[in-house]
């Protein structure tokens, strides 16, 4: 806390300018009129202030709107948003897009904090769903924005703000994430011919279905080995020798190196060893010839 | 009066990770972000990491990326950089400094860290 | 990124002579900038912020000014401990960066 004194004669600020640079802490909360702050924000930016200058204007700030800054105030913020904490932040009202694109631009190349995770929850809720300009902007600046979401807020975002997303956007996703955005995606490309389709939906399809997967199959997609390996390994497991053939194309010869891991593993597990065999890879492990094989869960589907 | 103090440099191989200390005195530590710099050998200064007095900000210099991390104990008054997957062009001496927004107003005396086979 | 770049790389000058050592910012940097001078084996040490502020203990015969783009530090007569490299450096934005060096050597 900045203790009270007079302004000393003639420092009395009469603009926000680059004078102030060279004033104390306590000059600065004595002769800095809160209200000339507020009005002149977009000037503060210009000025290279101390971040212990900064402080006092933000204590300013704060005095003078003790209920949240305004969005005209907020908008300006620049340099001083990196000295607001998440409390201050959830004060706010953020309701425009371009407010938004200001702050965050102020912390571009920094590692998500907890005030850009308040202010991005803050303008998201504010707007009701995560729209697709919205989403736009967020994945611009932070790509992996969306593999930071629940399962339950990324049911919030519509089938048409998909097309925003791209590739890397995703990296980060788990399986449950996944299953939420692939129906989105399915619907939001499904206007789309065969390898467009399968161009757009490929990031999406750790949360494909099997029947989705014996779909893709029929299509001459040639899937690569790093999209089949990032599937579900229960959407995987079913799938014939010939269906994954069809699948992956020319990359199935891929399989081998990835014999060992799930989910060419588990797979490798469920299949007959002839049926392995006519890939001509020498894949191991399949069940052998002449055993047979029972689906129990079929079974105790049944009983 | 204000010191800054760096320690943990030394040899490593290519790939191989390393902890820097910075001790600070003679000021209150938790009121401050601070710095990481670097120099490589014969060569100008880069600025590759900084934190805010509560940690809650931060910044990593693209070169540093995924493989730097930047901490702080402000019971300790202490800050630190743990360096993971070093490559050769990381040799530098490595500076701890003040940081006050506009510039740097303190620094340490660098400790050096060579990356070699 | 803003590149800083500093000329003249290096300058050999004697001791009374006035220095003008120059920054150019690839963009507007306001007055965001500070001066720093190294000693061989030395951390650098702060001179001028907000490109004219001189700290407090650095003698009156360093300056600093200019604002935008274009910015110099004058040595206004060279004294004996005043040959060092000397950096720019800017912080209008992330991440911050600074100039190659001027070296300062006795002629």
């Known amino acids: 806390e900045v203790e009270k004194t007079a302004c000393p004669s003639g420092k009395k600020a009469r603009e926000i300018d680059e004078s102030l640079i060279f004033y104390k802490k306590w000059e600065l909360e004595a002769c800095v009129d809160a209200a000339l702050l507020a009005t002149q924000m977009d000037r503060v930016n210009a000025i290279p202030f101390t971040y212990e200058q900064l402080d006092v204007l933000k204590h300013k700030l704060d005095e003078l709107y003790p209920q949240g800054y305004p969005e005209s105030v907020i908008q300006h913020l620049g340099y001083l948003f990196l000295k607001m904490s998440p409390e201050d932040i959830r004060k706010w009202n953020v309701t425009s897009l371009e407010t938004l694109k200001a702050l965050l631009e102020v912390n571009k190349g920094h590692e998500m904090s907890p005030q850009v995770a308040t202010l991005i929850d803050r303008f998201v809720k504010g707007r009701g769903q995560l729209d697709k300009d919205t989403l736009d902007t967020l994945t611009a600046f932070y790509p992996g924005y969306l593999c930071s979401l629940s399962p339950e807020e990324l049911s919030s975002v519509p089938p048409s703000s998909i097309w925003a997303v791209r590739p890397q956007d995703l990296d980060t996703c788990d399986p449950r994430q996944l299953d939420v955005l692939y129906p989105k995606a399915r619907l939001a490309f499904q206007n789309m011919n065969g390898s467009e389709y399968f161009v757009k939906i490929q990031s999406f399809l750790g949360g494909a279905p099997t029947e989705d997967l014996k779909a893709l199959s029929q299509q001459n997609v040639s899937m690569d080995l790093a999209t089949f390996m990032k599937l579900r390994t229960d959407a995987v497991l079913p799938l014939t020798v010939a269906e994954v053939q069809k699948l992956l194309g020319p990359h199935v010869e891929g399989l081998k190196a990835e014999e060992r891991h799930r989910p060419v593993r588990d797979w490798i597990l469920r299949q007959r060893q002839d049926d392995l065999d006519t890939l001509g890879l020498g894949l191991q492990g399949g069940i052998p010839n002449g055993y047979l094989v029972l689906d129990l869960s079929m079974q105790e589907a049944l009983s | 009066q204000v010191q800054l103090v760096e320690s943990g440099g030394g040899l490593v191989k290519p790939g191989g990770s390393l902890r820097l200390s910075c001790a600070a005195s003679?000021?209150?530590?938790?009121?401050?972000?601070m710095s990481w710099i670097r120099q490589a050998p014969g060569k100008g200064l880069e600025w590759i990491s900084y934190?805010?007095?509560?940690?809650?900000?931060?910044y990593y210099v693209d070169s540093v990326k995924g493989r730097f991390t930047i901490s702080r104990d402000n019971a300790k008054n202490s800050l630190y950089l743990q360096m993971n997957s070093l490559r050769a062009e990381d040799t530098a001496v490595y500076y701890c400094?003040?940081?006050?927004?506009?510039?740097?107003?303190?620094w340490g005396q660098g400790t050096l860290v060579t990356v070699s086979s | 990124d803003i590149q800083m770049t500093q000329s003249p790389s290096s300058v050999s000058a004697s001791v009374g002579d006035r220095v003008t050592i120059t920054c150019r910012a690839s963009?507007?940097?306001?007055?965001?900038l500070a001066w720093y001078q190294q000693k061989p084996g030395k951390a650098p040490k702060l001179l001028i912020s907000?490109?004219?502020r001189l700290q407090s203990g650095v003698p009156s015969r360093f300056s600093g000014s200019g604002s935008g783009t274009d910015f110099t530090l004058t040595i206004s007569s060279l004294q004996p401990e005043d040959f060092a490299i000397y950096y720019c450096?800017?912080?209008?934005?992330?991440?911050?960066?600074f100039g190659q060096g001027t070296k300062v050597e006795i002629k």
């Open positions: 934190i805010s007095s509560s940690e809650s900000i931060i």
């Open positions: 003679g000021f209150t530590f938790s009121d401050y972000y």
């Open positions: 963009q507007d940097i306001s007055r965001w």
């Open positions: 450096q800017q912080a209008k934005s992330f991440p911050r960066t």
């Open positions: 907000a490109a004219s």
């Open positions: 400094a003040r940081d006050v927004g506009s510039h740097f107003d303190y």
